[in-house]
């Protein structure tokens, strides 16, 4: 048999707090325990769940946990079932609510001397005890002119008068806790002699030179006084108007009219109502002068077909706030469709090429109207007008590769040469239409070129191969004047290139044939042993079939190369003495001699009195000084070659003779004594 060791029992519980209904079972077989609430099985949730055989509540809920709970134990094998005693919760709770007007039916019906009933919508279990407050002060039972029942939630004021005006609130408490009204009620019962607002002036915005009207009315018994004041507290009446309010009129009904409004009229106006009793009622309204600023400029916009784009129009600052609308081709845009206005935005959905053009954002208010245009371009993918083509360009001449495309906006064209971006420089120029000009075609310009034409909508590209048609030219051009050493072997080279390999031959300029000791070997003129007769003018001729022939003239001179007969020697001279550096050279043509001292050429015309160069080439320096020390170079040159030789010059102090030295003792170095 199934036996309940612990059964659930009814208990007090607090809303939102923990609770546990206990249930423990003993049985011979395996039993399955579950719970019923008002006869229906209880499903586990995070808030309410079985814990062992007991039912645990993480937070009791007065709505979901009201009813009768029962623990059921069942042996699934035998089918035997046992049910516990019923158990329920006495749930304690309190919930805040507003203070509402119960009587009369609406605030408008509240009059002095009528009965007013307020109701406190705080509920709870057990039933709460209520406390009423006016302007935060507790109201006690039996207080003059009102009856308050703390058992009930109603507050009755009978009869209601101006002294009952105030902010009414309530609080309530029970065994669960305390709550106060979530929304309070303001009771306003006017004293008939107090000034009451019938019509309050409103802020107005007017354009310059327009008129402005402020309405203001009060009521009271007896009728109240009404007065208008401007910012600086200056009273405005029809009899005494301040200078800056000459065009102000106060009407019998209290309205104030201002005509031809100027900036100085802008400001705060006060309408003051004073009853027989009570404080003055002050109402304020501001007069604003309408204004509208300029609109910021739009950047031109480039959009691609098929996309959705928006252009926001920032309305100019203005008073009143300017209204904004978009126009295209003079027509106001709709608020829906493919091209439409949404708020301040121009929306272009699924852009078409035909949407390109000028759109205008308008802004307007009382002060006037402003407009700003935005230019919308719908980008298209470039199309070819002329693609670059494989080209044969002539060496040394300008060459052109075309990359002509059309698109909106104008496409950007860039060129690549061997995958390297081409810059503009002295040899390459890119025209704005995309044409590439190679100013002076060189052999190595023969390669691949690629142009890319792009817009925001996309790119197209094409490539072309350039073949350079080589000029027929000497490589390198022979020197026009050359020397050969007499009685020696000599060669004069001549080579050329062209579209086809040229043949090269030499001939004498006078047309005579070459002597037998002179051979022409594949463009190299070879002299086995140079004679005086070999001097003269020769012509190298390079020719091929397609390009004809070119000629290079060379004047050959036969010379005896320079040798030194006398070379300068290392020389040491006493300070103040004269130094002689000898140098003599021979050759044909007869060589000229120049001297270089201390790394500069000694100009014979500017040597000064101390230095002199003799006809035979020797250099003499009189009255030598220490700064004359250094390396001196003798340079011998003629039209065929140049040679040089050098020697150092030392300038030393003359030693003072010692006793032991005989008059004939030689100095320790080679010395010139003069």
């Amino acid at each position: 048999a199934i036996v309940f060791i612990k059964q659930p029992s009814s208990q007090d519980a607090l809303q939102g707090r923990r609770a546990l209904l206990r249930c423990e079972v003993e049985a011979p077989g395996l039993v399955h325990v579950y719970w019923l609430l008002d006869g229906a099985p209880v499903q586990d949730t995070e808030r309410r769940f079985t814990q062992g055989s007991s039912l645990s509540f993480a937070a009791v809920d007065r709505l979901q946990d009201s009813g009768t709970f029962q623990c059921v134990a069942r042996d699934d094998v035998t089918g035997e079932e046992a049910r516990s005693a019923n158990a329920s919760f006495n749930i304690k709770w309190i919930e805040a609510g507003p203070v509402v007007l119960k009587h009369p039916a609406s605030e408008a019906e509240i009059q002095p001397q009528t009965q007013v009933t307020l109701r406190c919508h705080i509920d709870g279990h057990p039933r709460p005890t209520y406390q009423w407050f006016r302007d935060g002060t507790p109201l006690s039972d039996g207080q003059s002119n009102n009856t308050v029942s703390s058992k009930e939630r109603n507050l009755t004021l009978r009869p209601a008068g101006p002294e009952h005006s105030g902010l009414y609130s309530c609080c309530a408490h029970n065994a669960f806790g305390q709550a106060c009204s979530s929304q309070n009620f303001t009771l306003s019962i006017a004293d008939e002699s107090f000034a009451r607002v019938v019509l309050a002036p409103q802020d107005v915005i007017v354009a310059r030179n327009e008129e402005a009207m402020f309405h203001c009315q009060f009521s009271a018994q007896p009728p109240p006084n009404l007065q208008w004041l401007f910012e600086d507290e200056t009273p405005i009446t029809n009899r005494s108007r301040p200078p800056h309010l000459r065009r102000a009129t106060v009407f019998a009904n209290g309205s104030l009219l201002l005509t031809q409004v100027r900036p100085r009229n802008a400001g705060v106006y006060r309408c003051i109502g004073q009853g027989q009793r009570g404080p003055p009622v002050i109402l304020e309204a501001t007069l604003h002068l309408a204004e509208i600023e300029d609109m910021p400029l739009f950047e031109p916009r480039v959009f691609t077909a098929g996309s959705e784009e928006r252009v926001t129009c920032l309305p100019p600052k203005g008073l009143p706030e300017p209204s904004v609308w978009w126009e295209h081709a003079g027509v106001r845009l709709p608020t829906h469709g493919r091209v439409y206005q949404k708020g301040h935005e121009l929306v272009l959905a699924s852009i078409a090429e035909s949407d390109a053009g000028v759109y205008t954002c308008h802004a307007a208010n009382l002060a006037g109207q402003r407009r700003q245009d935005v230019n919308i371009t719908v980008a298209t993918v470039p199309t070819w007008l002329k693609k670059p083509q494989d080209s044969q360009l002539e060496e040394g001449k300008p060459g052109y590769l075309h990359c002509l495309t059309q698109a909106t906006p104008k496409p950007t064209v860039v060129w690549y040469r061997n995958q390297m971006l081409i810059s503009e420089d002295s040899r390459f120029e890119v025209f704005k239409n995309g044409t590439l000009r190679i100013n002076n075609v060189e052999v190595y310009d023969g390669t691949w070129y690629r142009c890319v034409s792009s817009t925001p909508a996309g790119s197209i590209e094409a490539q072309a191969r350039v073949q350079v048609l080589e000029k027929l030219k000497f490589t390198p051009p022979p020197q026009p004047q050359q020397c050969m050493e007499f009685d020696k072997e000599a060669t004069v080279p001549c080579s050329a290139t062209g579209r086809e390999k040229p043949t090269i031959k030499w001939e004498r300029a006078d047309g005579s044939s070459l002597p037998e000791w002179v051979t022409d070997n594949a463009g190299t003129l070879h002299f086995a042993r140079v004679t005086r007769d070999d001097a003269g003018n020769y012509t190298c001729i390079a020719s091929n079939g397609p390009q004809g022939q070119i000629r290079a003239h060379v004047q050959l001179t036969v010379a005896v190369f320079i040798t030194f007969k006398v070379e300068p020697e290392r020389t040491t001279v006493y300070q103040g003495h004269t130094a002689l550096l000898q140098c003599e050279a021979q050759g044909d043509p007869k060589p000229l001699i120049q001297w270089k001292g201390k790394d500069r050429i000694l100009d014979p015309t500017k040597l000064g009195p101390r230095m002199h160069i003799f006809q035979n080439g020797s250099l003499v320096i009189h009255d030598v000084a220490p700064e004359d020390s250094g390396r001196y170079t003798c340079i011998a040159g003629n039209s065929c070659n140049i040679k040089h030789t050098e020697a150092p010059l030392y300038v030393v102090d003359k030693p003072v003779p010692e006793e032991s030295e005989g008059p004939g003792s030689p100095p320790p170095y080679k010395m010139i004594q003069t």
Partner: antibody
Framework: QVQLQQSGAELMRPGASVRLSCTAS????????LHWVKQRPDQGLEWIGR????????EYAPNFQGAATMTADTSSNTAYLHLNSLTSGDTAVYYC??????????WGQGTLVTVSA | DIVLTQSPASLAVSLGQRATISCRAS??????????MNWFQQKPGQPPKLLIY???NQGSGVPARFSGSGSGTDFSLNIHPMEEDDTAMYFC?????????FGGGTKLEIK
């Protein structure tokens, strides 16, 4: 060779207008875009705008819209920059330059405009 | 408008050493697979001279010691080894979109 020769220095009174010229040699201005760039004393560079001399199409930086006007005369191969209502803020060197693509490889020598009362 | 921020404003580098100038764009200057960032050198009384175009390509006649790198929004100009003749103002410039804009400039001097 490519050259951009700019007009000489100008000393102007505030409120006056001035027209600067840029004469090209070694190329036809119709084949390129011409740009104008401003440089105030010891300051950075400001792009004023560019003109396509072939059709007179212009683009300006927002700061110069309305304050500067670019024109070109293809018959004399010359571009012009017109500055009106001059103020001290317009005291600067103005350069003209040339592009075929998107990099400025050639510049004029510059024209100094001084605005002083 | 695309704003270019150059740093540092001035730089002193010893002869033979490396000078690096940075330029940051307020938005990407890449388009059509090209970075439209260019570098100019300017000496007193002279117009600017194109050093580097399209971020990393050397202008005509520009010595190999000048090199540029970067893409998107971050770019740099390197000068190595620094020579006496490199004392000048250096400007970055974007030509991705109108208006073309320049960086504030970097004054490069010899330490």
């Amino acid at each position: 060779q490519v050259q951009l020769q700019q007009s000489g220095a100008e000393l102007m009174r505030p409120g006056a207008s001035v027209r600067l010229s840029c004469t090209a040699s070694g190329f036809d201005i119709k084949d390129y875009y011409l740009h104008w760039v401003k440089q105030r004393p010891d300051q950075g560079l400001e792009w004023i705008g560019r003109i396509d001399p072939e059709d007179g199409d212009t683009e300006y930086a927002p700061n110069f819209q309305g304050a500067a006007t670019m024109t070109a005369d293809t018959s004399s191969n010359t571009a012009y920059l017109h500055l009106n209502s001059l103020t001290s803020g317009d005291t600067a060197v103005y350069y003209c330059s040339r592009t075929g693509t998107r990099w400025i490889a050639y510049w004029g020598q510059g024209t100094l405009v001084t605005v002083s009362a | 408008d695309i704003v270019l921020t150059q740093s540092p404003a001035s730089l002193a580098v010893s002869l033979g050493q490396r000078a690096t100038i940075s330029c940051r764009a307020s938005e990407s200057v890449d388009n059509y697979g090209i970075s439209f960032m260019n570098w100019f050198q300017q000496k007193p009384g002279q117009p600017p001279k194109l050093l580097i175009y399209a971020a990393s390509n050397q202008g005509s006649g520009v010595p190999a010691r000048f090199s540029g790198s970067g893409s998107g929004t971050d770019f740099s100009l390197n000068i190595h080894p620094m020579e006496e003749d490199d004392t000048a103002m250096y400007f970055c410039q974007q030509s991705k979109e109108v208006p073309w804009t320049f960086g504030g400039g970097t004054k490069l001097e010899i330490k």
